[in-house]
């Protein structure tokens, strides 16, 4: 996706000081999807627009972060700003859909990530590099920290795979891309096996 961060920042920077305060207050009470935590009040109230944007993306990922921002803006009566986010969401959706087309054949036979789960748990050593690549776009801040908290590479990979069932094709493609960059020979080996 990637566009969401810029879109959220533009929206938040286009709020007056009072509107940004109101946005934060509403963010503290807005109904969240199951499985998502709330940004701590103390930290939230101190944030400027750039910090808040990054926090929204790391806590809720780009797609839901964008949706949440839209919801709060609409609740504040700021339709115009919300509409612009809606446009970004639709554009990003089209891009994501287009990007996932080549992967349809792999979806039928099982994605690389699912097919090689055991081997990846056993053989990926540079887990932190993989996590950094997924941080904010696929993994929430909490998930990122949870994986990093594990001590061995295998445990980290097991923890990472515990989040995979809730991922879509784009998320799995992102993991595959990260693995290709960090462990190209491992990926090549597994693709040929």
């Amino acid at each position: 996706m990637g566009r969401a961060r810029d879109a959220i920042l533009d929206a938040l920077e286009n709020l007056s000081g009072d509107e940004l305060k109101k946005f934060k207050m509403k963010l503290l009470t807005v109904q969240l999807r199951e499985g998502y935590g709330r940004i701590p009040r103390g930290a939230l109230l101190q944030m400027d627009a750039i910090d808040l944007t990054d926090k929204l993306v790391s806590y809720y990922l780009e797609s839901y972060g964008l949706e949440l921002t839209m919801t709060v803006l609409r609740d504040m009566g700021l339709q115009e700003l919300a509409e612009q986010l809606q446009t970004t969401k639709e554009e990003s959706g089209a891009v994501a859909a287009a990007a996932s087309v080549p992967a349809q054949s792999t979806a039928r036979t099982g994605h690389f990530v699912d097919q090689h789960r055991q081997a990846l748990i056993a053989r990926v050593t540079e887990v932190d590099g993989v996590l950094d690549a997924l941080h904010g776009s696929v993994l929430t801040e909490g998930q990122y920290q949870a994986v990093r908290a594990e001590t061995t590479s295998q445990d980290k990979m097991r923890k990472l795979f515990s989040f995979v069932p809730s991922w879509n094709l784009t998320c799995k493609d992102s993991l595959l891309q990260a693995l290709k960059e960090i462990h190209p020979y491992l990926v090549m080996d597994l693709e040929q096996s």
């Epitope: 920042l9 533009d10 286009n14 007056s16 509107e19 115009e80 700003l81």
Partner: antibody, heavy 112, light 106 residues
């Protein structure tokens, strides 16, 4: 399609002021921020600052504070940058840009 | 402010060659943006949020990195890729650009 149309080339005297314009079309003017970027001949890009038209929030690189003033006129969907106390160092091409679209640039020449 | 240092400053590559341009930040940034500029024209938005290609950018381009280290890679150099490339951070005000990398074709 977002378009940014910048004003024409300017020739100014040292010590004078000049106001460059950037007319936006094809998107909701108040929903984007507009950045201004300087490029001297054969040199790299320098970020001057940014204005968010709806809120009026502005951010500047310290180097350009006191030199550049960014404003925006919502009814005409136009952003402006005023440069004051001009010197030869201000001779450059100035671009306006939104998230991912750029204007064609305005060439400013400061000469006596 | 965050200083971005690009390397190399100038380089030339043969058609078909792999090219990597790096951008190092003086402190950690969340994303990197890349622009392509050819002489006498406005910069073009090229890669956004570290690794996403802007509309119309050929698939031979890719972007990667995190923290303070980012890169733009061309898998197989083509004549039309000869240009100057700039990185930009939008994580902290003032936003800043790298000094640019001029890429020439051999």
């Amino acid at each position: 399609q977002v378009q940014l149309q910048q004003s024409g080339a300017e020739l100014a005297r040292p010590g004078a002021s000049v106001k460059l314009s950037c007319k936006a079309s094809g998107h909701t003017f108040t929903s984007y921020g507009i950045s201004w970027v300087k490029q001297r001949t054969g040199q790299g890009l320098e970020w001057i600052g940014k204005i968010y038209p709806r809120s009026g929030n502005t951010y500047y690189d310290e180097k350009f504070k006191g030199k550049a003033t960014l404003t925006a006129d919502k009814p005409s969907t136009t952003a402006y940058m005023e440069l004051r106390s001009l010197t030869s160092e201000d001779s450059a091409v100035y671009f306006c840009a939104t998230r991912d679209y750029w204007g064609q640039g305005t060439t400013l020449t400061v000469s006596s | 402010q965050i200083v971005l240092t690009q390397s190399p400053v100038i380089m030339s590559a043969s058609p078909g060659e792999k090219v990597t341009i790096t951008c190092s930040a003086s402190s950690s940034v969340s994303y990197m943006y890349w622009f392509q500029q050819k002489p006498g024209t406005s910069p073009k938005f090229w890669i956004y949020s570290t690794s996403n290609l802007a509309s119309g950018v050929p698939a031979r381009f890719s972007g990667s990195g995190s923290g303070t280290s980012y890169s733009l890679t061309i898998s197989r150099m083509e004549a039309e890729d000869a240009a100057t490339y700039y990185c930009q951070q939008r994580s902290r005000y003032p936003w800043t650009f790298g000094g640019g990398t001029k890429l020439e074709i051999k």
